[in-house]
């Protein structure tokens, strides 16, 4: 199984001497180290605990441990002029302003650089007028708004509720729907679950607790100023008005206590239906603006924040392979944070910290992985995933070449229920057959595998007996290497029971109170799932970085590209009428979809009966499944947006957290019965189903035996 | 009706002890953080500590942290303060106080205990 | 930690004044205010909380107004019985500090 040339350790305990090395008191002891103040991007602080990652590392035994810095735009209110919303009477005067801050958790009091609750890149504004109610101000919120209720949000401030959709889908929407202001609000329908108490009594979102975020719309592109390359000493800027992504309209999030303020005033039309009730005790009119005897009041958004080019430090080690050293397995995650990290990302950064001391014990005994492992800590993912963009874009063409895989390390946890994965197709069967060597730390699974366990609490739903495995969407580190390189990727976490638990993400989320004692107290008081992970993303990095054959397997996309094409033929065929009409037919990708199905079975066979004692022959096979994810990647990208170039995966234009399968085409087809000239816009779903046959029957073509 | 009585005050010299209690009813007990505050003869209110919902975490004044220790048996709807190596400045009426949450105002308050610390 | 500020220390006034009492937080509070009052050998009992919100059972002859570091409590028209100390508290992180009291005599 994984065996390696340059070890003085017996080839089968290689991966048993790693897990076992795993330590849940010192992830525990990592957590707490890196928790104790705040990390945010761009800050002293954050390059202080870059240089002391650094050194750690080097002290774990990594053979080199660099520095890597770029000079991006980031965003900060500004100190002495802070962000807040008030209601203004006739008269203009100020008769509720929302909170500044923030109550400090217990213990926290006397912490100073506590960054206020603000949304990032929020242009500066003083916008009043009307309130509008969108809901989570989705497309198809807006949808509802504007053509079944006739509610026009032009020239409106409008206030979201946080969930369902990342933030920056958000703002575009509004936008885009004429918005002068966006107000965020976490509803404790989404951040309340019935029976938790609040922070710091439980792992429930209080009153005052604010979501801070980034709100850009970059598409992949990494430093706002500087797209398709590094933001390094010498680097070209675009100005402020070319930068790539940043919103145009001031936005602001609150807490639920301030929210309740702004809502209960609020008449116009009364909410469509009962999906667009939160939990506060208001009516969630819909407005436009306030009822009776509030009407002549309105709200005014007060946002000077600025945006500022800073400093940003990646700390990349390198632990060098002994038989492929230009072969790379990347293990990254992020170290910047919104306050103190509990969960993001210090949760993810103190696995991370644990695996390298592992791999170093390891290299310490005289061991050396087959391939060169990189070990990467990410800075300003908070920003728009700046550090890990810019790194990929400044070492692309070494990627491109070299880059096995990418495993990302963000937050461990967002609940103790399960294990939760997302990641390429090629990676199915290396996840089903590590989860099924390892325990399952679950209550009643005692003495089981955590691959029963997550089976039994997450069900695939295609296949019975196996666990649930989701598409990559973006919002995270994996992003540049996936969605831009084409390099395969995953990620791991435990969660949450998605069953009972309808809030969106974890309720503290990017809030103050994400401190070390919400981990440790509430999520995971003997850091067994944390040691899980740790187990899953580590042993995942060992197999990828040691395995004599890669351990992917391309039968596992065959399966998911039938599935996709099935799917995307089925929406396509909501429009019977109109396929006949523009002559829409999908039989070239499910033609491809067959050949690639074929030509993978037979590479497979392949696989099974080559020479492994060949270097030459098995570069070659280890070369096709390197590349496959690559031969994915359309050099043109997608419409609109160049740095998504995976034609099969994107993050969702409605969602960046949700991936998409055959983004190209899903987008020709959205909406579709809308369109102004349905004979383009049916053009252009016949030219995506050419890309995407194109792209499959290449890919599979890669596969095909060399001569 | 919310009721919250208080007991064990008197007199105690430097360096004793004392132990007071509180008994509640009229509330559902463990659904309320619980406090104690004090009140030196002729001057304002200060906060001594406080306890949250099942006794997991506990809040003092910073002075006070080594010497005193709050607790709660929910079982008997009772909160205790023991004080140890009580000094004359320690000498006040302690109230029992209850609220809501972390960040809450005091809506419940017993009638007060006279703790005199005097040789 | 947060000091509260009261004044006056003690005001005279006569039954159907108007009375104003001022609470200055060192730092931001937003609104995470409370007032109460105290009649002699009694227990303070909760008037107003929020900074704004009217407790159970007081009369609406009290108000409260302000955010952030600036709180006032106004007693529209003092009634016989609204002689005593009143209190503001903080509840905005620990240790939740009182202002030091305005006592309100009979002119």
């Known amino acids: 199984k994984s065996s390696n040339e340059a070890t003085n350790i017996t080839p089968k305990h290689n991966m048993k001497a790693f897990l076992d090395e795993l330590k849940a008191e010192n992830i525990k002891k990592f957590l707490y180290n890196f928790t104790q103040i705040p990390h945010l991007a761009g800050t002293e602080q954050n390059f202080q605990l870059a240089k002391q990652i650094q050194s750690q590392w080097k002290e774990f035994g990594l053979d080199s441990v660099e520095l890597a810095h770029y000079d991006v735009l980031l965003s900060y209110p500004n100190k002495t002029h802070p962000n807040y919303i008030s209601i203004i009477n006739e008269d203009g005067n100020e008769i509720f302003n929302t909170s500044l801050f923030e109550p400090p958790p217990p213990g926290y009091e006397n912490v100073s650089d506590i960054v206020p609750p603000f949304s990032a890149f929020s242009p500066q504004g003083m916008p009043e007028g009307d309130l509008v109610y969108v809901n989570y101000a989705r497309t198809e919120d807006f949808f509802k708004l504007e053509r079944d209720m006739k509610i026009n949000c032009s020239g409106k401030i409008v206030i979201a509720r946080y969930g369902k959709v990342f933030r920056g889908n958000k703002v575009k929407n509004a936008q885009l729907a004429g918005a002068k202001g966006v107000i965020l609000y976490s509803d404790p329908a989404d951040y309340f679950a019935p029976g938790v108490k609040s922070y710091p009594d439980g792992w429930n979102l209080p009153g005052g607790g604010v979501q801070r975020g980034n709100i850009l719309n970059l598409n992949g592109a990494g430093d706002p100023l500087t797209p398709g390359y590094p933001a390094n000493e010498y680097a070209y800027r675009r100005g402020i008005a070319e930068a790539v992504g940043l919103p145009s309209i001031p936005v602001h999030p609150i807490g639920y206590y301030d929210a309740q303020k702004l809502l209960e005033k609020m008449g116009g039309s009364a909410p469509p239906d009962s999906s667009w009730r939160g939990s506060l005790k208001v009516p969630y009119n819909v407005g436009p603006g306030f009822t009776g005897n509030f009407s002549t009041q309105k709200v005014k958004m007060h946002i000077h924040s600025t945006n500022e080019v800073t400093r940003i430090y990646n700390v990349i080690g390198t632990l060098r392979g002994a038989v492929e050293p230009d072969r790379y397995v990347i293990l990254g995650g992020h170290r910047d944070s919104w306050v103190f990290g509990g969960i993001d990302p210090q949760s993810g950064a103190a696995v991370v910290h644990e695996i390298v001391r592992s791999f170093g014990t390891l290299k310490k005994e005289g061991w050396r992985p087959r391939r060169t492992i990189l070990f990467a800590s990410w800075d300003a993912e908070e920003f728009g995933l700046l550090g890990s963009t810019e790194w990929a874009e400044e070492n692309s063409r070494l990627l491109q070449e070299r880059g096995v895989a990418y495993i990302n390390a963000d937050s461990s946890i967002e609940g103790n229920y399960t294990l939760r994965v997302d990641c390429t197709p090629l990676m199915y069967s290396l996840v089903h057959n590590l989860t099924k060597e390892l325990k399952s730390p679950d209550e009643g699974f005692e003495g089981k595998s955590l691959y029963e366990s997550w089976t039994k609490k997450s069900p695939s739903p295609e296949f019975s007996g196996m666990p649930r495995i989701s598409k990559l969407g973006s919002g995270n580190d994996f992003e540049v290497f996936f969605q831009r390189l084409g390099i395969a990727s995953g990620r791991a976490r435990y969660t949450k029971n998605w069953e009972t638990n309808k809030f969106s993400g974890y309720p503290l989320y990017h809030s103050v109170y994400e401190t070390y004692e919400l981990v440790e107290k509430f999520y995971d008081p003997m850091f067994k799932y944390h040691l899980t992970v740790a187990q899953v993303r580590g042993g995942m990095v060992f197999e990828l970085a040691n395995s004599i054959v890669l351990p992917f397997d391309c039968r596992d996309y065959a399966v998911v590209l039938r599935k996709y094409a099935d799917k995307i033929y089925s929406i396509s065929m909501k429009h019977p009428q109109e396929m006949k009409t523009y002559s829409v037919s999908f039989d070239s990708l499910f033609s491809a979809v067959k050949n690639f199905t074929e030509i993978a079975s037979k590479f497979s066979e392949r696989l099974q009966d080559f020479d492994k004692s060949n270097p030459i022959v098995l570069r070659m096979m280890n070369d096709q499944l390197m590349f496959l994810e690559r031969a994915f990647i359309d050099p043109l990208g997608l419409p609109d947006r160049p740095f998504y170039r995976h034609v099969i995966y994107a993050p969702s234009s409605h969602n960046k957290y949700a991936g998409e399968s055959f983004p190209g085409i899903y987008d020709a087809l959205f909406d579709i019965e809308s369109k102004v000239d349905p004979s383009k816009a049916w053009g252009e779903v016949k030219r995506q189903i050419y890309v995407a046959a194109f792209t499959v029957q290449a890919a599979a073509e890669t596969l095909s035996e060399v001569a | 009706e919310v009721q919250l009585v208080e007991s064990g005050g008197g007199l105690v010299q430097p360096g004793g002890s004392l132990r007071l209690s509180c008994a509640a009813s009229?509330?559902?007990?463990?659904?309320?953080?619980m406090a104690w505050v004090r009140q030196a003869p002729g001057k304002g209110l200060e906060w001594v500590a406080s306890?949250?919902?099942?006794?997991?975490?506990?809040y003092y004044l910073d002075s006070l942290k080594s010497r005193f220790t709050i607790s709660r048996d929910n079982a008997k709807n009772s909160l205790y303060l023991q004080m140890n190596s009580l000094r004359a400045e320690d000498t006040a009426v302690y109230y029992c106080?209850?609220?809501?949450?972390?960040?809450?105002?005091?809506?419940?308050w017993g009638q007060g205990t006279l703790v005199t610390v005097s040789s | 930690d947060i000091q509260m500020t009261q004044s006056p220390s003690s005001l005279s006034a006569s039954v159907g004044d108007r009375v104003t009492i001022t609470c200055r937080a060192s730092g931001n509070i937003h609104n995470y205010l409370a007032w109460y009052q105290q009649k002699p050998g009694k227990a303070p009992k909760l008037l107003i909380y929020?900074?704004?919100t009217l407790a159970d059972g007081v009369p609406s002859r009290f108000s409260g107004s302000g955010s952030g570091t600036d709180f006032t409590l106004t007693i529209s028209s003092l009634q016989p019985e609204d002689f005593a100390t009143y209190y503001c508290q903080h509840f905005w992180s620990t240790p939740p500090t009182f202002g030091g009291g305005t006592k309100v005599e009979i002119k």
């Open positions: 106080a209850g609220s809501d949450g972390y960040w809450a105002w005091f809506a419940y």
């Open positions: 009229g509330f559902t007990f463990s659904d309320y953080y």
């Open positions: 306890i949250n919902y099942d006794g997991s975490s506990t």
């Open positions: 929020n900074a704004e």
